[in-house]
C-alpha cells in the first residue's frame, strides 16, 4: 500500500495509473466504500463523501490514462486509505494528513516559551523534528517546547515529521518581540547633549502599548520614574515626565529619548520597559549613562568619572602629545601642581579611547580655561 | 526667523566625493533632527540621510548606505553630508530639512538647496 | 518600503475651480501624511501636516483628508497664486517616502 503524507489546508494529488494510455472508466473510493469521483464518459462525476466539494480530478490527464483525486484543504479527518478502481484493478494509497500549530501567538515576546502542537491522524506514531532559525534541532513527539526564546529564534523555524519513512516539512514564522540590545552604555563629558535610542527588533504595521524609563542614578539611594508614554500605532506620546531632568521623547519609532546635558547627578543605569496590548509580560531594555568631568582646583587637576564603569577601564590624566602621568582603574584620578598647556583626561578600554575631556591649564598665574 | 542655507555643491567624476554643508539660524539647531533630500526632475523628491538632534543616531535609506555619511556640529549650529563612490545618478539638487522632532518625522522648514552634477 | 502613488501627474483647472489631488499608500500609515507645494526656483514649503492640520499661515481653501492607505488634498476655490508642484510626503515609517508630485496648471 503506497503512502502519501499531506498538510492541514493543503492540496494534495494522489495519483491512480491504468495501463492503457486513454480514457476509461475510473472510481475513487474511500474505506467505507464510499464513492467520492469518478467519470462518464468525458464527465466527472461526484458521490456523496464528506469530500464532495473539495475533491477533483484532472480531466486532461485522463486520455493519458492518469485519473488523480485532487483534496483541496486537507483536513486532519481526511486520513484515510482511498481506493482507485480502474480496469478491474484496484490500487489503493493511505493518505495521512498532519498539522503542525504554534500553541500561543507567533509573535512571543523574548524569555516566553514557544510550544509547537502536532495534529496527528489516530493510528500514526510520527516524529517530529525542528530546526530554528540560528540552527538549533529539537526533537519530540505530539508536542516540542522551547523554553526563554531569544532573538535569535525570530524566523522561519522547519519542521520535519516522520511516519512510514516519508516526510512532509512544515515551515513556521516566528516573531521573537525584544529591543535589538539587551543593553547599552553612553559615554559623555558634563555639559553634553545625550542620546538614548531603544531600536525594536522587529516590524510589526500596528504598534500599541505604554512603556516607562525607570532611573537609578548612582548618587541616589532610590530608582526613580524619569519618563511614561504611551504608544498608538507607532505613535510616542508623552504621558508624564520628570521636571529633573526634562527628558524629550521623539514622536517617531525607534524610541528616542534626549537629555538636554549630561550632569554627574545623572550617571547610572535605567530600565526602559514596553508593555505591547494584548501582550503579557514587558519588553526591556538596559541604558547606562558614564558622565566625565575634568576640573582644575588651585594646584589640583581632577578628573572623574561617574556611572556604572567596569573595573577593567582606565581612567588616565596626560599632557597633550606626552606619556599618562597618571593611569589608574579608578572612578577619580589628579595631579599635583600641574604643567601648563592642554590636558586630556581619558576613559580607556584596552586602548580604545571611550571619553575624552580636554582641559587647558594656564601658567600659575592665570586660571584655567575649558575649551 | 528659522534659516538653512546649503553649500558645497560642484561637478564632480563620477566615483569621486563631496561635502556639503548647511548653515542653521533662527532656531535652537541642537533641538532638532535634520535630514537631506534631493530633488531631480525625473525622480522627483528623495529623503537621503536623517541625522538625530545630538547627533548620535543616523538613518539612511538602503540606496545610499555606505556611500553618504550625515554629520552635525552642534556648536557650529551646521549639517553635513560626505558623500562618496558618487554616481550620475546622485545628480540632483540637494536640500537641508528640519524635523519638527528631535529624532525624526516630518520636514517643517527647508533651505534654498545646492546642485551636485555627476559627470565625467 | 512605504511607496506612494500620487496622481494625477498634472491638472489643469479654472480659477475659482476645485482640485483634488490623492495620495495612495502600499501600507497601513494611519493619518501620516503630510502635503507641500512648491513653486518653481524654490524649496517645498510645508502645507499639511499629520493629522490633516492646516500649518499657520496656509489659506483655509487647502484642506486634506484620509486615513490607512487613502488621502486627499483639496483647494476648493483655485486662484492663479496656487500654481505650482504639490506634494505628499508619508511620515509613518522610514524610509520617508514622497509621492512623484502633481503640476498644477491653469485652464
Known amino acids: 500500500k503506497k503512502v502519501v503524507l499531506g498538510k492541514k489546508g493543503d492540496t494534495v494529488e494522489l495519483t491512480c495509473t491504468a495501463s492503457q494510455k486513454k480514457s476509461i472508466q475510473f472510481h475513487w473510493k474511500n474505506s467505507n466504500q464510499i464513492k467520492i469521483l469518478g467519470n462518464q464518459g468525458s464527465f466527472l462525476t461526484k458521490g456523496p463523501s464528506k469530500l464532495n466539494d473539495r475533491a477533483d480530478s484532472r480531466r486532461s490527464l485522463w486520455d493519458q490514462g492518469n485519473f488523480p483525486l485532487i483534496i483541496k484543504n486537507l483536513k486532519i479527518e481526511d486520513s484515510d486509505t482511498y481506493i482507485c478502481e480502474v480496469e478491474d484493478q484496484k490500487e489503493e494509497v493511505q493518505l495521512l494528513v498532519f498539522g503542525l500549530t504554534a500553541n500561543s501567538d507567533t509573535h512571543l515576546l523574548q524569555g516566553q516559551s514557544l510550544t509547537l502542537t502536532l495534529e496527528s491522524p489516530p493510528g500514526s506514531s510520527p516524529s517530529v523534528q525542528c530546526r530554528s532559525p540560528r540552527g538549533k534541532n529539537i526533537q519530540g513527539g505530539k508536542t516540542l517546547s522551547v523554553s526563554q526564546l531569544e532573538l535569535q529564534d525570530s524566523g522561519t523555524w522547519t519542521c520535519t515529521v516522520l511516519q512510514n519513512q516519508k516526510k512532509v516539512e512544515f515551515k513556521i514564522d516566528i516573531v521573537v518581540l525584544a529591543f535589538q540590545k539587551a543593553s547599552s552604555i553612553v559615554y559623555k563629558k558634563e555639559g553634553e547633549q545625550v542620546e538614548f535610542s531603544f531600536p525594536l527588533a522587529f516590524t510589526v504595521e500596528k504598534l500599541t502599548g505604554s512603556g516607562e524609563l525607570w532611573w537609578q542614578a548612582e548618587r541616589a539611594s532610590s530608582s526613580k520614574s524619569w519618563i511614561t508614554f504611551d504608544l498608538k500605532n507607532k505613535e510616542v506620546s508623552v504621558k508624564r515626565v520628570t521636571q529633573d531632568p526634562k527628558l524629550q521623547m521623539g514622536k517617531k519609532l525607534p524610541l528616542h529619548l534626549t537629555l538636554p546635558q549630561a550632569l554627574p547627578q545623572y550617571a547610572g543605569s535605567g530600565n526602559l520597559t514596553l508593555a505591547l496590548e494584548a501582550k503579557t509580560g514587558k519588553l526591556h531594555q538596559e541604558v547606562n549613562l558614564v558622565v566625565m568631568r575634568a576640573t582644575q582646583l588651585q594646584k589640583n587637576l581632577t578628573c572623574e568619572v561617574w556611572g556604572p564603569t567596569s573595573p577593567k577601564l582606565m581612567l588616565s590624566l596626560k599632557l597633550e602629545n606626552k606619556e599618562a602621568k597618571v593611569s589608574k582603574r579608578e572612578k577619580a584620578v589628579w595631579v599635583l601642581n600641574p604643567e601648563a598647556g592642554m590636558w586630556q583626561c581619558l576613559l580607556s578600554d584596552s586602548g580604545q579611547v571611550l571619553l575624552e575631556s580636554n582641559i587647558k591649564v594656564l601658567p600659575t598665574w592665570s586660571t584655567p580655561v575649558q575649551p | 526667523e528659522v534659516k538653512l542655507v546649503e553649500s558645497g555643491g560642484d561637478l564632480v567624476k563620477p566615483g569621486g566625493s563631496l561635502k556639503l554643508s548647511c548653515a542653521a539660524s533662527g532656531f535652537t539647531f541642537s533641538s532638532y533632527g535634520m535630514s537631506w533630500v534631493r530633488q531631480t526632475p525625473d525622480k522627483g523628491l528623495e529623503w537621503v540621510a536623517t541625522i538625530s538632534s545630538g547627533g548620535s543616531y543616523t538613518y539612511y535609506p538602503d540606496n545610499v548606505k555606505g556611500r553618504f555619511t550625515i554629520s552635525r556640529d552642534n556648536a557650529k549650529n551646521t549639517l553635513y553630508l560626505q558623500m562618496s563612490s558618487l554616481k550620475s545618478e546622485d545628480t540632483a539638487m540637494y536640500y537641508c530639512?528640519?524635523?519638527?522632532?528631535?529624532?525624526?518625522?516630518?520636514?517643517?522648514?527647508w533651505g534654498q538647496g545646492t546642485t551636485l552634477t555627476v559627470s565625467s | 518600503e512605504t511607496t506612494v502613488t500620487q496622481s494625477p501627474a498634472s491638472l489643469s483647472v479654472a480659477i475659482g475651480e476645485k482640485v483634488t489631488i490623492r495620495c495612495i499608500t502600499s501600507?497601513?500609515?494611519?493619518?501620516?501624511m503630510n502635503w507641500y507645494q512648491q513653486k518653481p526656483g524654490e524649496p517645498p514649503k510645508f502645507f499639511i501636516s499629520?493629522?490633516?492640520t492646516l500649518r499657520p499661515g496656509v489659506p483655509s481653501r487647502f484642506s486634506s483628508s484620509g486615513y490607512g492607505t487613502d488621502f486627499v488634498f483639496t483647494i476648493e476655490n483655485m486662484l492663479s497664486e496656487d500654481v505650482a508642484d504639490y506634494y505628499c510626503l508619508q511620515s509613518d515609517t522610514l524610509p520617508l517616502t514622497f509621492g512623484s508630485g502633481t503640476k498644477l496648471e491653469i485652464k
Open positions: 530639512a528640519r524635523h519638527e522632532d528631535g529624532n525624526w518625522n516630518y520636514f517643517d522648514y
Open positions: 499629520e493629522g490633516n
Open positions: 501600507t497601513d500609515i494611519d493619518d501620516d
